[in-house]
Amino acid sequence: QQQTLPKPFIWAEPHFMVPKEKQVTICCQGNYGAVEYQLHFEGSLFAVDRPKPPERINKVQFYIPDMNSRMAGQYSCIYRVGELWSEPSNLLDLVVTEMYDTPTLSVHPGPEVISGEKVTFYCRLDTATSMFLLLKEGRSSHVQRGYGKVQAEFPLGPVTTAHRGTYRCFGSYNNHAWSFPSEPVKLLVTGDIENTSLAPEDPTFPADTWGTYLLTTETGLQKDHALWDHTAQNLLR
């Protein structure tokens, strides 16, 4: 006999990276017929929803209207059908951004390079942080973590046209509190015409969507959570 129900899906809209003082919605999707959903924050009960009528609802939403460092951390949800509880969802790491300062991102030897050249990004922030994150805009979750007292370097090695794109970096004060994003640096990698045509840029969101950070970690923010890309989430663990 089944002792628990399948775990629900949990995600954040518009994104798990939330600028401070902005709104975020935590979504939990379980099964039709669930009479109760519980949202847990850092292991403690945070919110409860008892949807009505339960047979017509399989997803609930929990609002955080004003993101701050106290609300940043790990969330999970569970649901109940009758007396039977589900397994807990995966952990959702909610990150508050736009904290304190803005790092500077630079690239060596420069933003325009030839395929095969070694490229290194440098992220610098003069305030108290020792962890840095380099993110490439787009849907394929190019995220790297680096360390340094005031600067971290991110060697990309010999680049190909697949490295083309727009990069930004963050300073991280802890796993769930990040700085403002740096100004973008667009890396242009030129190769021979044949190679270039065979290696298009990653599909990216329009530049103005950076403000809500719809950029890198989910598979296009699709609701098919079987396609969820955990790269940046795993980076936080």
Epitope: Q23, F41, F46, A47, V48, D49, R50, Y63, M71
Partner: nanobody, 130 residues
Amino acid sequence: EVQLVESGGGLVQPGGSLRLSCAASGRTFSRLPMGWVRQAPGKGLEWVSAISWSSSTTYYADSVKGRFTISRDNSKNTLYLQMNSLRAEDTAVYYCAAVGGSLDYSATVVYTAARAYADWGQGTLVTVSS
């Protein structure tokens, strides 16, 4: 922002009852999940009870379950906490609290952690002593 003013606190003997009230003004009270949070002398904040804006969902901390009842009257912009079978360990300042924002909260959702609340009253002291 919503302004909250609690009343009804006082001195009561163990086993006695009190009814706290919280009058709200400002943001649309009738669409806000609400709660009660308390702080015992020398202790941190402890969430006590919560109610959805429609009153369809109520939730209680284990320490008060079966003794306290939360309710609201949206036509009067007032939140209540009926406290029965009071114990010495219920002695605390009781705060009425509202979630933040002007969002379309579910009619059935409650928030069960002190950190979830944005707007707070000044508190009313409940002392349980013989």
